[in-house]
Amino acid sequence: VPLSRTVRCTCISISNQPVNPRSLEKLEIIPASQFCPRVEIIATMKKKGEKRCLNPESKAIKNLLKAVSKERSKRSP
């Protein structure tokens, strides 16, 4: 569950559940910073614009990131 915060981390809970790349509207990868010492991944789904915090350590999520970056590199000229 993400919470909007100016300081500190956004994600309160994280999911290991794989996400279908086709159902993704947006995938935000927030690098660790002075405000939050960990990487955060926030998926926005096409359906209802629902958001979900993903576990960066999960194998399924790592595979999702690979799939998304592969898709992006296909699209870019």
Epitope: C11, I14, E50
Partner: antibody, heavy 121, light 109 residues
């Protein structure tokens, strides 16, 4: 099955301290934010505190800020609430509850049975 | 701090009737951040509705949620004997406290 079990409640004098525990089982505790919610006798629900899945984020209700501390031990699948400077108005049933991680906000989907704290001289 | 007001305080109805419970916020709440809970005497609360309108796992379809902004509604289409309880709305906005409403008691007429 998914379960939360609170313990540590009891009768305590005003100004004293008490530590509540909440043992989690049946799910990946280290992925879930956790809440404490209380209910005074005959009253409604009052949110008390929240801790993020890895303990980085902590949030408190104004009524307990500076007196209560929420913490967790992910290696033991246990949530804690350290309560100091207790007052009569802290008398309540204290519930721990799981912040459901599979969405933006899916509410508190798993609750313990509650533990009773009575502050009385 | 967002304050939630629930009405009516008590709703006296018979089994089979429709129950309409209201939850009003003192300022706009994103629909994603509103939940409804049911609590029976001596029991812990149970999540019914999240995101204002999505039913939690295992919740019968006679329960439905609607609304946006400051006005939200929980509807029980046909009351079953086990539905007589207290119902709370809760907001989980962009900053704490994650307040609950004062509750609506649905009792048997």
């Amino acid at each position: 099955q998914v379960q939360l079990v609170e313990s540590g409640g009891g009768v305590v004098q005003p100004g004293r301290s008490l530590r509540l525990s909440c043992a989690a089982s049946g799910f990946t505790f280290s992925n879930c934010g956790m809440h404490w919610v209380r209910q005074a006798p005959g009253k409604g629900l009052e949110w008390v505190a929240l801790i993020g899945y890895d303990g980085i984020n902590e949030y408190y209700a104004d009524s307990v800020k500076g007196r209560f501390t929420i913490s967790r031990d992910n290696s033991k699948n246990t949530l804690y609430l350290q309560m100091n400077s207790l007052r009569a108005e802290d008398t309540a049933v204290f519930y721990c509850a799981r912040d459901w991680p599979e969405g933006y906000y899916n509410g508190m989907d798993v609750w313990g049975q509650g533990t009773t704290v009575t502050v009385s001289s | 701090e967002i304050v939630l007001t629930q009405s009516p305080g008590t709703l006296s109805l018979s089994p089979g009737e429709r129950a309409t419970l209201s939850c009003r916020a003192s300022q706009s709440v994103s629909s994603s951040y509103l939940a409804w809970y049911q609590q029976k005497p001596g029991q812990a609360p149970r999540l019914l509705i999240y995101g204002a309108s999505s039913r939690a796992t295992g919740i019968p379809d006679r329960f439905s949620g609607s609304g946006s902004g400051t006005d939200f509604t929980l509807t029980i289409s046909r009351l079953e004997p086990e539905d007589f309880a207290v119902y709370y709305c809760q907001q989980y906005g962009s900053s704490p406290p994650f307040t609950f409403g004062p509750g609506t008691k649905v009792d048997i007429k």
